[in-house]
Each structure stands twice: as C-alpha cells, then as structure tokens.
C-alpha cells in the first residue's frame, strides 16, 4: 500500500518557500515525484524536492551553519579585538609618558645634556615600543646602547665640560671604559632585569589576544564538510520535502548533528581552556618588576640615580678615563671633581601618590574574568547553537531526519541514519587542518606563557626585593644607594591614571629646542573610559 | 673589515732593541685605545702595555722603564720601542684595540726572539 | 696587583656543559672579558662585559659575573671548542689590565 501523499498535494508551499532562497521555480516540482535522484532527502513516498534543491539546501545550511558560529563567538571576539586593542594604545601610551618622564628629567635636572639626550632616550623608548610589538631587539642591547650613548655626552659635557666638540672621536673608547670601570654602577644590569622581565611579559601578554583573536577567527570561518553539510540539511530542511514546513528539529537531534558537525572545533576546548588559565596566571603575576606601567614609568628616576652615581665618583673617574679616553690634542688629564650642584637641580621634586580608581591591573584582571566567563566556550558551542536554532522543546512532535516523531529517540535515530552516512565516521575524521594549526599555536603560546619567569603568587616579594626593585638595598655596594628617597628624588608612586593631565609632557619631537609643553591627545583619554589620572612627578 | 698588521719581530740578543709596529685598518684608528699583549712560548697572555686615545701610556711592572708604547693617528700605526730586552721577554707580541667591545681585535702576532 | 685565578684544565664529554671559573677579589664588581685562543693563532673575543656575545659566537658560549667569581659556560660542547680560555679584566686601581692563566679546555 502507497504510503499517504505529502499534505501540499501541490507542492505550493513548498514553492514559495524555495523561492524565497533560490528565485526562479524551475528545480520545483508542481507535484510531488519520486525523488529516485535524491541523495539526502530519501523519500519514503513522493516528495516535493528535486536533486537540484537538495543541493541548494545544502549549500544553504553550511551557510546557516557559518552564520550561527559567527553569531556564537561574536560577543567573544568582540571582547578579544577590544582588549588587545585597548591594551596595545594603553603600552604605547605607558611607554610616551615614560619617555616624556625621563625627558623631563633630563630637561629639570641636567639641561646640558638635554638636546643628545633627548635624542638617545627617543631611540631607546621606540625600541623598547618595538620590542612589545613583537620585534626581534635584545633588551639588553637596548639598555647598553642607551648608557653606551648618554656616557660620553655625560663625560664631555658634565665631567669635562671644556672639551671640544670634536672630543667625541672617542666615543668607542669612552664606551669601553663606560662598562669596564661600570661608571654607572649597576644600575643598567638592574634596569635590564627590570625592563626585560616587563617587557617579555607585556609582549606574550598581548602575543597572547592576538592569539586569542586568530583562535576565533578560524573557527569563524571555518568551511564545514559535504558530510556535515548533508546532516545540517536532513535536519533543517528535508522535512520541506514532505511539506511539513513548520516542524522543528527534535532538540537532541541537533545536538547529535552538532557534535558530529563540530567534532574537530570541541577538540580546541582542551587547549582553550588551558589558554584562558594560563593567560590568568600570566595576568596574576603581572605586577612589580612584571608591570612594564610600574617600571617603565619609574625608569626616568633609575636613570636618575644611576646617574647620581657617576657623579659621586666624578673625581676618581675623570682621572681615570681622562689618560685612557683623552681627545688626540688633549694632553693634561684633568682631575676635576664636580660639586652636586652642577648637576642636579635644587628643586625638590614631589609626586603626590593619588590612590587611582582604574589602572591597567584592574583592567587585566577585568578581562581575564570576563574571558573566563567563556573558557568552555567550545565545548558549549553545539549546545549553544542548537539553542541558538529553532528546534523543538521537549523533544516532543519534532523532526528527527526521517519524520515527524511523538517523541525523539537518539537510538532510532542513529539506526535510520545508518544507510545514508556514518555519524560516527564523521566524528573519527579528526580536525581540518586549519584547526589543527590552530590547536599547535595554542598550544605553543600555552607553553610560553606557562613558562615565563613570572613569580607565584604574592610569597616572592621577598625575591624581588632582593634583585634590588624598590629595595632598600641597592646591591652589593651600598654606594649605589644614591637619593633613594630623600629630598630632591623623583619617585612616580605606581601606576598610571588615564585621565591624563600631563603638564611637561613633552615629545622627543618638540623637546630639543622648544619649552613648550605638549598635553596628551584626547582620544588618548577617551580610549581608557577615563582609567583614573596621569599625575605628572614633575610639576 | 677590521685589520691590524704586525710587523718588526726577530731574533735579538739580550740587551739588545727592537721595535714592533702595528698598522690598523677598516676602522677610525684614532677613537680607539690600543693595547700590547704578549705569550711566552707554551704560556698564558699577559698585558704588557697600552695608549690610550689622546697618548696616555700604560705598562705592565715587568717592562717598565724598558719598553715604550707611542702611536700615530696619521699613519694609523701603533709601535712598540723594546729596550734592555731579556730573555725572559721571549714571546709571541700581539696588537689589539681597545673600544665598546673591550680588546675585541687583535693582530696576527709577531715572535720575538732574546737570545744570545 | 690584581689576580685572577683560573684552574690549568677542565675536561668534558662532546654535548654536555663545561664551565670555566675565574676567581678574583671582589671581582663583580668589575667587567670580565672571555677569549678563546686555539694553537697557532691569536686569541677571539667570546664573551665581553661579563655577559655580551660578540655576533658570531654560538649562543651556546655565556658568561656570568658575581662575588669572586666570573665563569664562562659552554653548553653542547662540541669538539671545535677545545682550546684554551683566558679571563681578563681592566683594574682601574693599579691601571693594569690583567689576564688570568688559562684553562685549557679537553674535549673527551
């Protein structure tokens, strides 16, 4: 006995519903046929689709697919894009006032020196900006190049200020004997570690969003498989076929589909999740000598003290590199000592410490919360996007691929999926290769971030303390112990507030001949939703 | 690239003289310091002199008063005026410069031989 | 004057990690200086300002300076690096430069 004809004896609704995806009737029956040609849609009586539509449905339901994935990991890669935006212009900005500091500095404390000066920090702070986006610099070059080049502008124009110009001939020897004799100390080794550690910490950190971003956009525009493809259309539209336009999908139904579809994007979960933990513990450490805000924004006052140092040791110094380093027409070497107030400016220089409402701590941590609100992100997806689809509630009177059912069992429906193509195959294939790419690049950057040199909690302040931040020691050689806090002492009291009303803030660009004083762009301020103050340490 | 050429080693007598010479090349002669280092047969280097760039000379104990340093920038050269010359100063004398790097060029060598 | 103090040799087997230390008074707080010296030919500058490699050098050679002892390590030694090592520092004081004797390194 025929099994019953489809509702729509006429195909009608069936028509003006293909239509609104594909204009034009032509591949529309009028009346239901046999369907013998139908790979996906298997008949089991007359139907209202030809081979033509099934393909159309197909194409259409991998690009339902893509739209609801792209639906799903919107507000997620929004978040992602914001952050790494907002924090890449937050670090250039950290890194302008922390240039703008030492600038300042230079300008208040050794004006002398200030138009080379100027020159040499511009240098050092655009390789330092460099280096967080991802260039291949040595910090410690970095460092050494900034002294290499300060010293003999120091030594020619604040130790032996009657030289002539023509006395930096001996730049390579004065450099030389810079390190030998450690003139400064052992301020460069200690600003090394400092920015260093900072910087590598504040690269990976945003290595890591970029990462975070790249994760996201490849399982956005992932092309799912002619096997998906033909599940997602059993499932959305095949029921069209039998007229039953207004059946949903039974919930667990999808939910089987959706695993199989998106067996390969779950395996990133794994990875995801180690991602978001690892970026967590990276964000936790992020503090003292790991806060490249705290030290590169204390860095003018490190250069301050270091040096302060060569000072101290002017006389003996002199003597010493003035027989080594001697310009050519130079004969007598001058033991000249230079009291303190040729070099420092007798202004006692005060930072107010105004407890800051929102910094780039907060707004870390801030994000990594909100990211871990999302951190079984792809092992949630199928669920999501079923829930996301319409399907029936209850998995009561909903289509289950074949019919229409009172109630839907996963068995039978595996069974009757059984001939058409194997669920289970489909699922063993393992990822495309754009996601296993994009699993060993999580991977990698789990590794690194896992592995940064970052202390373990709050214990090791005593560590720190040790490799000379903030200590009161200041190495072995209690000399080096220049200024630490007294009179005359700049020190910025931690972190930077956003709402920025930087008096001296001036620019390499405008600073060598020209007082004026710059103030920082708007959309500076407008970018941090007011992050709190930027207290300038020189007023 | 960076050069520097010895010459004026041999065989000398005990009491005798010698002068060693050292052309530098590929490099701004005189922005650098210039040292004298030498190695006795089957021993270890040991410092003998250096100039600095303006003509402050230094020596080792062993050699003072006997031997002189000098150098000109004209001629890009660097000179070692070995007097009283002892058994004892038997070694293989290396030029080398002195700049950022420390002593981070050196010449090819030059033997020089006291003997009677 | 100033002394550095080096021992005469040091032996180890091809990829593993030598290290030749340097001893000296309070010798952290000068530069040490690292050449490489092989029979026949004039010294090479390996490790400069305690730490700093000269471009060329393998990163395999690094130095390290603190207290009374400066030591160079060579990790994955590999059979061209046996020679001899001198350490070397500039004493301002005595306005000396002053080498150590060497440490012939034997790769086995």
């Known amino acids: 006995q025929p099994p019953p004809p489809p509702p729509d004896a006429t195909c009608h609704q069936v028509r003006s519903f293909f239509q609104r995806l594909q204009p034009g009737l032509k591949w529309v029956p009028e009346t239901p046929v046999p369907g013998s040609d139908l790979q996906v849609c298997l008949p089991k009586g007359p139907t209202c689709c030809s081979r033509k539509m099934e393909e159309k449905y197909q194409l259409t339901a991998r690009l339902n697919m893509e739209q609801l994935l792209q639906s799903a990991s919107m507000e997620l890669k929004f978040l992602i894009i914001q952050n790494a935006a907002v924090f890449q212009e937050a670090f250039e900005i950290v890194v302008r006032h922390a240039k703008n500091y030492t600038n300042a500095m230079f300008k208040n404390n050794y004006p002398s020196l200030t138009p080379q000066a100027f020159e040499f920090v511009g240098e050092f702070f655009t390789d330092v900006s460099l280096y967080i986006l991802g260039s291949d610099i040595n910090v410690d070059d970095m460092v050494n190049e900034l002294f290499d080049s300060l010293f003999p502008v120091i030594y020619t124009q604040l130790m032996n200020p009657g030289l002539p110009d023509s006395a930096l001939d001996i730049n390579e020897c004065l450099r030389g004997a810079r390190r030998d004799l450690k003139v400064f100390g052992n301020f460069p080794k200690l600003i090394m570690t400092q920015v260093s550690k900072s910087l590598q910490v504040t690269r990976i950190f945003l290595q890591a969003l970029n990462l975070g971003i790249e994760v996201i956009n490849t399982t956005d525009h992932l092309k799912f498989s002619k096997d998906c493809g033909r599940m997602l259309t059993r499932m959305w539209y095949c029921s069209y076929c039998q007229g039953l336009m207004m059946v949903k999908p039974c919930g667990g139904y999808c939910n089987v589909v959706m695993q199989g579809c998106m067996a390969g994007v779950v395996e990133i979960d794994k990875y995801w999740r180690e991602y978001i933990l690892s970026l967590e513990e990276l964000v936790n450490g992020m503090y003292r000598i790991y806060d490249m805000e705290n030290v590169l924004l204390g860095l003018f006052s490190t250069i301050h003290d270091s040096i302060q140092y060569v000072q101290k040791n002017a006389g003996k110094l002199t003597t010493t590199i003035g027989k080594l380093c001697a310009h050519s027409q130079q004969r007598q070497y001058r033991s000249a000592y230079y009291p303190e107030d040729l070099f420092i400016d007798k202004k006692v220089l005060k930072v107010a410490h105004v407890e800051h409402e929102e910094t780039l701590s907060s707004r870390r941590r801030e994000l990594i919360q909100k990211l871990k609100s999302f951190i079984s992100f792809y092992s949630a997806l199928p669920g999501y996007i079923c829930s996301h689809s319409p399907v029936a509630e209850n998995d009561t009177l909903c289509w289950n691929g074949q019919e229409l059912v009172e109630r839907y069992s996963q068995k039978a429906a595996r069974n009757g999926m059984k001939n058409q193509f194997n669920l289970h195959e489909l699922k063993m294939k393992g990822p495309e290769p754009v996601v296993s790419q994009i699993i060993d690049k999580l991977k990698h950057i789990n590794q690194l971030l896992r592995t940064m040199s970052m202390p373990k909690g709050r214990v090791l302040d005593k560590n720190l303390d040790e490799e000379g931040f903030e200590s009161g020691d200041c190495g072995d050689d209690e000399d080096e112990c220049i200024g630490g806090s007294g009179d005359g002492m700049i020190k910025v009291k931690n972190q930077l507030r956003f709402l920025a009303e930087l008096a001296y803030d001036l620019d390499v660009d405008d600073a060598p001949g020209n007082s004026q004083q710059a103030t920082p762009k708007d959309n500076e301020i407008s970018t941090f939703h007011n992050l709190g103050n930027v207290h300038s340490p020189l007023k | 690239q960076v050069q520097l050429v010895q010459s004026g080693g041999g065989l000398v007598h005990p009491g005798g003289s010698l002068r060693l010479s050292c052309a530098g090349s590929?490099?701004?002669?005189?922005?650098?310091?210039m040292h004298w280092v030498r190695q006795a047969p089957g021993k270890g280097l040991e410092w003998v002199s250096a100039?600095?760039?303006?003509?402050?000379?230094y020596y080792a104990d062993s050699v003072k008063g006997r031997f002189t340093i000098s150098r000109d920038n004209a001629k890009n050269s660097l000179y070692l005026q070995m007097n009283s010359l002892r058994a004892e100063d038997t070694a293989v004398y290396y030029c080398?410069?002195?700049?950022?790097?420390?002593?981070?060029?050196w010449g090819q060598g030059t033997l020089v031989t006291v003997s009677s | 004057s100033y002394v550095l103090t080096q021992p005469p040799s040091v032996s180890v087997a091809p990829g593993k990690t030598a290290r030749i230390t340097c001893g000296g008074n309070?010798?952290?707080?000068?530069?040490v200086h690292w050449y490489q010296q092989k029979p026949g030919q004039a010294p090479v500058l390996v490790i400069y300002?305690?730490?700093d490699r000269p471009s060329g050098i393998p990163e395999r050679f690094s130095g390290s300076n603190s207290g009374n002892t400066a030591t160079l390590t060579i990790s994955r030694v590999e059979a061209g690096d046996e020679a001899d090592y001198y350490c070397?520092?500039?004493?301002?004081?005595?306005?000396?430069?002053?080498f150590g004797g060497g440490t012939k390194l034997t790769v086995l």
């Open positions: 080398a410069r002195y700049g950022r790097k420390s002593i981070d060029a």
């Open positions: 590929g490099f701004t002669f005189s922005s650098y310091a």
């Open positions: 100039i600095g760039t303006g003509g402050g000379t």
């Open positions: 309070n010798i952290g707080s000068k530069s």
């Open positions: 300002y305690d730490s």
């Open positions: 070397q520092v500039w004493d301002s004081s005595s306005d000396h430069w002053v």
